[in-house]
């Protein structure tokens, strides 16, 4: 009599691994084997599925087959003994739609009061399934003290994450899963990883780090518990936080902030191009070194104050012509402020205290209807027109200029 077809065939796709499972029918015991064929779109004929021929078990792996992950694939199975069963067609599937996100790879590093988590995307580096998505993964984790069942969830983290405010010499366990929000796919948690935080460091990390602008330079300040220390500061492009596997993920020294003995350092604005950076500080007493401080975000556009404009005045008989230029940093380099500015100009007769105000978007401004041979004084400041920035500069230095006599030609 004919063999019955195998029952309940299931396709599992996890990352780039393609697994088939099925149930035997009752009579297909003994020397029964199973074989699969597959069919791609625009194909009339069926092809033997590599890795899934003459199987004695009820599971096979066909990951070696290079499929277009967006094609709809058809499968069929049959049982074989002396005679063979009829083919049983399996529901067709599209690999990318069917694919589940496997667990990411996790590497942990312990500090005294923190754990640094390095996460590699699911699949291998040459994964076909996630080839277009490797840099789009976000991760979430669950962490708990080994001695407790209280779990803390942390969502939407990137490939390198530091969990702070932990207890020294304590074992923490965590598990991580990946998600692709664009494809609405959420992966499975990986294995549990445990690590013990180190003995409390003799030197705590610097705290309360902030950047201010002073005398047209950046000043990085921080607090520290002990005196007679040296400090170093490092920076990193913020977007690299998402790509710790990339070779460009290198924290760099700020040259003016290497081995400083004060709890601040001053560096010129041309240290950084426009962008968002992370800054961190480390303390040392010559023998011991602290762990790095919490990283602070430093946005050159938002955190740098607007500098006052510089301007030239050309005197005419009944007017002053003002040309506004880019402000200069301390080393006479022009500041690039490529967001829209509006200028507030105050002017007055030198002998009077009555100020008049002009507000202009243009950098060329004429103040009309002035008295000839009269000294007028001018100062100006810039306002950002960008809603996000909403900042104003301080006023520029006052510049005074005398108008020409009435018969001067323009």
């Amino acid at each position: 009599k004919n063999l019955k077809s195998p029952q309940k065939v299931e396709v599992d796709v996890i990352d780039d691994n393609f697994i088939l499972r099925w149930n035997r029918s009752e009579e297909s015991v003994g020397n029964v084997t199973f074989s699969f064929d597959y069919q791609k779109p625009e194909m009339d004929n069926w092809i033997k599925l590599p890795g899934c021929q003459n199987m004695t078990s009820t599971k096979c792996n066909f990951s070696s087959l290079k499929l277009n992950i967006y094609d709809e694939i058809k499968l069929r199975i049959r049982a074989e003994k002396e005679n063979t069963s009829s083919w049983c067609e399996v529901d067709s599937f599209t690999p990318f739609r069917k694919a589940q996100i496997g667990p990411p790879e996790v590497h942990l590093e312990a500090e005294d009061k923190a754990i640094v988590i390095y996460i590699s995307p699911p699949g291998t580096e040459d994964s076909v399934m996630w080839a277009l998505d490797r840099s789009s993964f976000t991760y979430s984790l669950v962490i708990w003290k080994n001695s407790s069942s209280v779990e803390e969830r942390i969502e939407n983290i990137y490939s390198r994450h530091k969990i702070s405010k932990l207890s020294p010499e304590t074992t923490y366990c965590l598990k991580v899963k990946a998600a692709l929000l664009t494809s609405r796919k959420i992966g499975v948690y990986g294995p549990v990883h445990c690590i013990k935080t180190t003995v409390e460091n003799e030197l705590p990390p610097p705290e309360n780090i902030e950047v201010i602008v002073q005398n047209q330079n950046y000043v990085l300040k921080w607090d520290y518990t002990y005196a007679n220390m040296t400090f170093q500061v490092q920076w990193l492009h913020a977007f690299l936080k998402r790509k710790p596997g990339n070779h460009l993920y290198k924290w760099k020294q700020i040259p003016d902030c290497e081995n400083v003995t004060t709890t601040q350092c001053v560096f010129p604005p041309n240290t950084f191009q426009k962008g968002i950076y992370l800054l961190r500080v480390q303390a040392s007493d010559g023998n011991n070194t602290s762990f790095w401080s919490e990283e602070i975000k430093f946005d050159t556009e938002i955190q740098a104050s607007l500098l006052p404009p510089v301007f030239n005045i050309r005197s005419l008989s009944d007017s002053l012509h003002i040309s506004i230029g880019a402000p200069k940093w301390s080393e006479n380099k022009p500041v690039i402020q490529d967001y829209p500015l509006i200028y507030e100009i105050l002017f007055w007769e030198n002998t009077s205290k009555a100020e008049r105000k002009i507000i202009k978007k243009k950098t060329d401004v004429t103040i009309p209807n002035l008295k000839p041979l009269t000294v007028y004084c001018v100062k100006a400041r810039a306002h950002s027109m960008d809603e996000k920035l909403n900042k104003s500069s301080v006023f520029s230095d006052v510049v005074c200029e005398e108008t020409k006599s009435g018969n001067t030609s323009k």
Epitope: D126, S135, N246, L248, K250, K252, Q253
Partner: antibody
Framework: EVQLVQSGAEVKKPGESLKISCKGS????????IAWVRQMPGKGLESMGI????????RYSPSFQGQVTISADKSITTAYLQWSSLKASDTAMYYC??????????WGRGTLVTVSS | EIVLTQSPGTLSLSPGERATLSCRAS???????FAWYQQKPGQAPRLLIY???SRATGIPDRLSGSGSGTDFTLTITRLEPEDFAVYYC?????????FGQGTRLEIK
């Protein structure tokens, strides 16, 4: 002003060893990768590998792994590319370049290596 | 290793015309780590575009870069005599940095 100054042209015989250099100036040498790039006569650019002098991290491109050695001496802001046994197929122009977020933004003028018996 | 394939191999155009050079990656590349270079005979290459679309210092706005994922384009809007050269694309998303084989832009 950022500059990468490479050592002069070399003519060698097959089997000989060679070490060429690239001296960086005008920037913080330890904050940037240095890349070595090969260009065989009439051909395109091939990245051989990169070194980060700040921590001596070296990454070789697969086809150059084991064929050359990349090193750097940060005290004299110089990177090196060396061969222990040259082959005729090593005849090429070798460029060093500074590498960061902005790609290979500054290049040396190149060192022409000719290997011939 | 990520393979970059440039097309066309050679592009013959006249000054004033528009040039469109393509580069396709064998797998997805972060646009933050994609660049274009120009090389003239006897000279070292010169960086034109980084981050797929940002012009390097001193590069005129006739040149622009675009693209993401696996497909990237360099466009030169009005060709000048000095634009005729070989152009290379490059990915540095992976530390096994790779270049395309080059597109020769020649005067028609």
């Amino acid at each position: 002003e950022v500059q990468l100054v490479q050592s002069g042209a070399e003519v060698k015989k097959p089997g000989e060893s060679l070490k060429i250099s690239c001296k960086g100036s005008g920037y913080i040498f330890t904050n940037y990768w240095i890349a070595w790039v090969r260009q065989m006569p009439g051909k395109g650019l091939e990245s051989m590998g990169i070194i980060y002098p700040g921590d001596s991290d070296i990454r070789y491109s697969p086809s150059f792994q084991g064929q050359v050695t990349i090193s750097a001496d940060k005290s004299i802001t110089t990177a090196y590319l060396q061969w222990s046994s040259l082959k005729a197929s090593d005849t090429a122009m070798y460029y060093c370049a500074r590498h960061d977020i902005e790609g290979f933004d500054y290049w040396g003028r190149g060192t022409l290596v000719t290997v011939s018996s | 290793e990520i393979v970059l394939t440039q097309s066309p191999g050679t592009l013959s155009l006249s000054p004033g015309e528009r040039a469109t050079l393509s580069c396709r990656a064998s797998q997805s590349v972060s646009s933050s780590f994609f660049a274009w270079y120009q090389q003239k005979p006897g000279q070292a290459p010169r960086l034109l575009i980084y981050g797929a679309s940002s012009r390097a210092t001193g590069i005129p706005d006739r040149l622009s870069g675009s693209g993401s994922g696996t497909d990237f384009t360099l466009t030169i809007t009005r060709l000048e005599p000095e634009d005729f050269a070989v152009y290379y694309c490059q990915q540095y998303d992976s530390s096994a940095i790779t270049f395309g084989q080059g597109t020769r832009l020649e005067i028609k």
